[in-house]
């Protein structure tokens, strides 16, 4: 449905407030180093222009595409070359190449200072003094640090952020009210960003077909009562939404997401019995709620899958007529019966089924050839089940911090070339799978754990892609999206790695560690552990555990000492010497 002016169309659909917020997010995600004030100025200029187009869609330049309008605006930034270097070359290109060029320069790990939370009174004053600027700053700071954050969802986070300040800045104990809410938003925000990053990587690195397969599996688990045609329609619409957001088309994305939520709520009866509460909420909450809704109950008495997909004589005929539709139906039928499987496992099973049909439908006796295809699924199902059982056992034995340490050692031995901050960040996140998923009953453990691990390993993949240092990481990240986790799990010690030279400075600690938060102190110790393994990759777990126990005791002792700095200096030297002896250095 063509509009004379795309910018006017989106302005009218979204309303001024959402329009401005989404343009700010888009600009901050593209130009991640630009100061806040510069972005606000650009957004105001675009908004004023949009208003002229709303008034008269035939006005000059109103017929231009959003990419042209936004790209032209970004290219007016005076310091583009000094700040962004070769990204400035994008401005010499024409659309759509210019937008593709901007997308390629998005930085998953921008060199930006850590966001430090001011005192509660300072934040409340800023909030009251200028609420609009305060909330815009939130959008800007999150968007520039998370250039693939799902924009319509960021509007929902901003709404909750505003509600937290509105409520808590009037409370008797502002800090007790506000800080837990901000912590929750921060943690949920990081998780949301990482989940969306995987969707964008799936689309951009593996294509629309890969994303659609993921969506068929996930939506079929969530809406097992829905017909295949209904699930297919939802998948098509959802793919459009995420393709737009991942491509920087945030206005279209937000608009289409709203349309999809509207459609789902108008057709609840044929989709899921679990949507009622979601559909009573306002737009942003509604969309979020639908995205997180629990799986509906499976229809009773679903027939065996074997009848249509193994026993039928028409398997090859049906497959040949419309391969992707037939495979989509297989995936739908399997997924709706298995909410207890991870999406990536379901996709592995579908891939195995596809490979078998490709081979067997060309054989002399196809039916005889594919008759045992379901037997091939058993080891694929058992592999993640075993892995989760083992790791949950270890998590329950160790607790989160020590479980993270076990993963740090494991991944450093597998891919020691990866930077220490990346190994620490990724392993800490991998370790959170324990608290997140091991508490669940068996039927919910695998979808929780393996699909979460896919999100975390994608963080490793995107960070590594920026500065590739390990062929093994590149291989596991690029060969198959659904086999990333099994690929990393199967890696043994990298025998080609030359151990890092010992550097005393790396293992020198000071009294400042005593004033750090528990989390920051853990990160310091985990950084030292990674460096230790890089220095001594053949050290056994028992050896490393002994060194880490000594290290924890050393920090505790020196933080209790009267002269902390002297203690760290003297005891630190002894610890390094003892550790070198223990590890046979």
């Amino acid at each position: 449905d063509a509009h004379k002016s795309e910018v006017a169309h989106r302005f009218k659909d979204l309303g001024e407030e959402n329009f401005k917020a989404l343009v700010l997010i888009a600009f901050a995600q593209y130009l991640q180093q630009c100061p806040f004030e510069d972005h606000v100025k650009l957004v105001n200029e675009v908004t004023e222009f949009a208003k002229t187009c709303v008034a008269d869609e035939s006005a000059e330049n109103c017929d231009k595409s959003l990419h042209t309008l936004f790209g032209d605006k970004l290219c007016t930034v005076a310091t583009l070359r000094e700040t962004y270097g070769e990204m400035a070359d994008c401005c010499a290109k024409q659309e759509p190449e210019r937008n593709e060029c901007f997308l390629q320069h998005k930085d998953d790990n921008p060199n930006l200072p850590r966001l430090v939370r001011p005192e509660v009174d300072v934040m409340c004053t800023a909030f009251h003094d200028n609420e609009e600027t305060f909330l815009k700053k939130y959008l800007y700071e999150i968007a520039r640090r998370h250039p693939y954050f799902y924009a319509p969802e960021l509007l929902f986070f901003a709404k909750r952020y505003k509600a937290a300040f509105t409520e808590c800045c009037q409370a008797a104990d502002k800090a007790a009210c506000l800080l837990p809410k901000l912590d929750e938003l921060r943690d949920e925000g990081k998780a949301s960003s990482a989940k969306q990053r995987l969707k964008c990587a799936s689309l951009q690195k593996f294509g629309e077909r890969a994303f659609k397969a993921w969506a068929v599996a996930r939506l079929s688990q969530r809406f097992p009562k829905a017909e295949f045609a209904e699930v297919s329609k939802l998948v098509t619409d959802l793919t459009k939404v995420h393709t737009e957001c991942c491509h920087g088309d945030l206005l279209e994305c937000a608009d289409d997401r709203a349309d999809l939520a509207k459609y789902i709520c108008e057709n609840q009866d044929s989709i899921s019995s679990k949507l009622k509460e979601c559909c009573e909420k306002p737009l942003l909450e509604k969309s979020h709620c639908i995205a997180e809704v629990e799986n509906d109950e499976m229809p009773a008495d679903l027939p065996s899958l074997a009848a249509d997909f193994v026993e039928s004589k028409d398997v090859c005929k049906n497959y040949a007529e419309a391969k992707d539709v037939f495979l989509g139906m297989f995936l739908y039928e399997y997924a709706r019966r298995h909410p207890d499987y991870s999406v990536v496992l379901l996709l592995r099973l579908a891939k195995t089924y596809e490979t078998t049909l490709e081979k067997c439908c060309a054989a002399a006796d196809p039916h005889e050839c594919y008759a045992k295809v379901f037997d091939e699924f058993k080891p694929l199902v058992e592999e993640p089940q075993n892995l989760i059982k083992q790791n949950c056992e270890l998590f329950e034995q160790l607790g989160e911090y020590k479980f993270q340490n076990a993963l740090l050692v494991r991944y450093t031995k597998k891919v020691p070339q990866v930077s220490t901050p990346t190994l620490v960040e990724v392993s800490r996140n991998l370790g959170k799978v324990g608290s997140k998923c091991c508490k669940h009953p068996e039927a919910k453990r695998m979808p929780c754990a393996e699909d979460y691990l896919s999100v975390v390993l994608n963080q490793l993949c995107v960070l590594h892609e920026k500065t590739p240092v390990s062929d093994r990481v590149t291989k596991c990240c690029t060969e198959s999206l659904v086999n990333r986790r099994p690929c990393f799990s199967a890696l043994e010690v990298d025998e080609t790695y030359v151990p890092k030279e010992f550097n005393a400075e790396t293992f020198t600690f000071h009294a400042d560690i005593c004033t750090l938060s528990e989390k920051e102190r853990q990160i310091k110790k985990q950084t030292a552990l990674v460096e230790l393994v890089k220095h001594k990759p053949k050290a056994t777990k028992e050896q490393l555990k002994a060194v880490m126990d000594d290290f924890a005791a050393f920090v505790e002792k020196c933080c209790k000492a009267d002269d902390k700095e002297t203690c760290f200096a003297e005891e630190g030297k002894k610890l390094v010497a003892a550790s070198q002896a223990a590890l046979g250095l």
């Epitope: 083992q390 056992e393 076990a406 494991r410 031995k413 799990s489 010690v493 056994t540 777990k541």
Partner: nanobody, 124 residues
Framework: QVQLVESGGGLVQPGGSLRLSCAAS????????MGWFRQPPGKEREFVAS????????YYADSVKGRFTISRDNAKNTGYLQMSSLKPEDTAVYYC?????????????????WGRGTQVTVSS
């Protein structure tokens, strides 16, 4: 330290059986998981089977499932690998390993202590 010594290897015909033993000394055996790995001639070392510290969880490579059985006797500080329906492709040096986590992982680097190995040859 834990010392591990494998025994029970030898030459056997296809379809035959062997029982490998792994005797442990030095530390409390019951706090360790035990794994069996093998290295076929000219190939990488590969996982065969593992059993956790208490003996209630066992894991097998797909290639040996249904043919091999891992077990342990903590009172005797010994682990076992019962191998039946042996095939020529089972020919390898078999190693016993101990894992201080007590889990019984699939990856060889998770194991702290290793035996020297015992040769198993399946040939007619």
């Amino acid at each position: 330290q834990v010392q591990l010594v494998e025994s029970g290897g030898g030459l056997v015909q296809p379809g035959g059986s062997l029982r490998l033993s792994c005797a442990a000394s030095g530390r409390i055996f019951s706090t360790y998981a035990m794994g069996w790995f093998r290295q076929p001639p000219g190939k990488e070392r590969e996982f065969v089977a593992s059993i956790n510290r208490s003996g209630d969880s066992t894991y097998y490579a797909d290639s040996v499932k249904g043919r091999f059985t891992i077990s342990r006797d903590n009172a005797k500080n010994t682990g076992y690998l019962q191998m039946s329906s042996l095939k020529p492709e089972d020919t390898a040096v078999y190693y016993c390993a101990a894992d201080s986590d007590g889990i019984g992982w699939f990856n060889s680097f998770e194991y702290d202590y290793w035996g020297r190995g015992t040769q198993v040859t399946v040939s007619s």
